[in-house]
Interface confidence: low
């Protein structure tokens, strides 16, 4: 049988049209694979749901910045 190739890639085909409160976001990852039709950001919420978002939208950029700062701040 033919082999699978490399690792799985997740794609986003549409984006949420609702701004998600930053308090509800736990993490994010960027989707930049050439095998996907759109660059995207996938937010993981505090209840572990993943949602596709448009990286060009300001609220998405702000949310990523906020999460980056949270990660950089040591938890005591």
């Amino acid at each position: 049988q033919p082999d699978a190739i490399n690792a799985p890639v997740t794609c986003c085909y549409n984006f949420t049209n609702r701004k998600i409160s930053v308090q509800r976001l736990a993490s994010y990852r960027r989707i930049t694979s050439s095998k996907c039709p759109k660059e995207a950001v996938i937010f993981k919420t505090i209840v572990a749901k993943e949602i596709c978002a448009d990286p060009k939208q300001k609220w998405v950029q702000d949310s990523m910045d906020h999460l980056d700062k949270q990660t950089q701040t040591p938890k005591t």
């Epitope: 699978a4 890639v9 997740t10 794609c11 986003c12 085909y13 095998k35 039709p37 749901k49 596709c52």
Partner: antibody, heavy 127, light 110 residues
Framework: SLEESGGDLVKPGASLTLTCKAS?????????MCWVRQAPGKGLEWIAC????????TYYASWAKGRFTISKTSSTTVTLQMTSLTAADTATYFC?????????????????????WGPGTLVTVSS | AYDMTQTPASVSEPVGGTVTIKCQAS??????LSWYQQKPGQPPKLLIY???TLASGVPSRFKGSGSGTEYTVTISGVQSDDAATYYC????????????FGGGTEVVVK
């Protein structure tokens, strides 16, 4: 519909190009043109796909890299070039449309299935 | 490699009976699984995708289920027209649009 052509009886070591012509099939951003083969009395084996959209990106099964080349030659035509053929390449070669399914707005794994197939073209490699 | 193992290789069932075909992946494929039916001299026909969604025009006697590494297609009230070879296909590789097929299961209807 999809229709393959170019199947033939060839000698080991020869090269051959197969063509798939599509008619009346919608090729959106989320579809691929693919080749799958089936040796006589055996199972299905995926060979390669090409993005039917503008990118024309190509993808191969690891065993097919190097000896097989898939190309989108027009918006409705795809070819499969095969080199250094051996008896093990004797098979019916099917052209198929790979379609992606997804749920908005959640991330999708670009789930695919082959939802449309041609009748196949027979390639026989024998001396 | 996400290898797919299909069982049984062959099954015989009388008209009206129930046929169950299993497909096991070497690692989790997260429901990225399709099923095909192929009759002699014909190309395969898509039956089920996303593990459990019936393709257009497929009779409701076909049912797909499963998760993780184990998946099943069940044909309830099997008919003579269901005699064919059935293949599973995973699409959890690379960009998740490329796959491996199972080895196939021949269904004989008595």
């Amino acid at each position: 519909s999809l229709e393959e052509s170019g199947g033939d009886l060839v000698k080991p070591g020869a090269s051959l190009t197969l063509t798939c012509k599509a008619s009346g099939i919608d090729f959106s951003l989320y579809s691929y043109m693919c080749w799958v083969r089936q040796a006589p009395g055996k199972g299905l084996e995926w060979i390669a796909c090409v993005d039917a959209g503008a990118s024309g990106s190509t993808y191969y099964a690891s065993w097919a890299k190097g000896r097989f080349t898939i190309s989108k030659t027009s918006s409705t035509t795809v070819t499969l070039q095969m080199t250094s053929l051996t008896a093990a390449d004797t098979a019916t070669y099917f052209c198929a449309r790979g379609i992606l399914y997804y749920t908005w707005p959640y991330p999708a794994g670009a789930i695919d299935a082959f939802d449309s197939w041609g009748p196949g073209t027979l390639v026989t490699v024998s001396s | 490699a996400y290898d797919m193992t299909q069982t049984p290789a062959s099954v015989s069932e009388p008209v009206g009976g129930t046929v169950t075909i299993k497909c096991q992946a070497s690692e989790s494929i997260s429901n990225y699984l399709s099923w095909y039916q192929q009759k002699p001299g014909q190309p395969p026909k898509l039956l089920i995708y996303k593990a459990s969604t019936l393709a257009s025009g497929v009779p409701s006697r076909f049912k797909g289920s499963g998760s993780g590494t184990e998946y099943t297609v069940t044909i309830s009230g099997v008919q003579s027209d269901d005699a064919a070879t059935y293949y599973c296909q995973q699409s959890y590789s690379s960009s998740n649009v490329f796959n491996t097929f199972g080895g196939g299961t021949e269904v004989v209807v008595k």
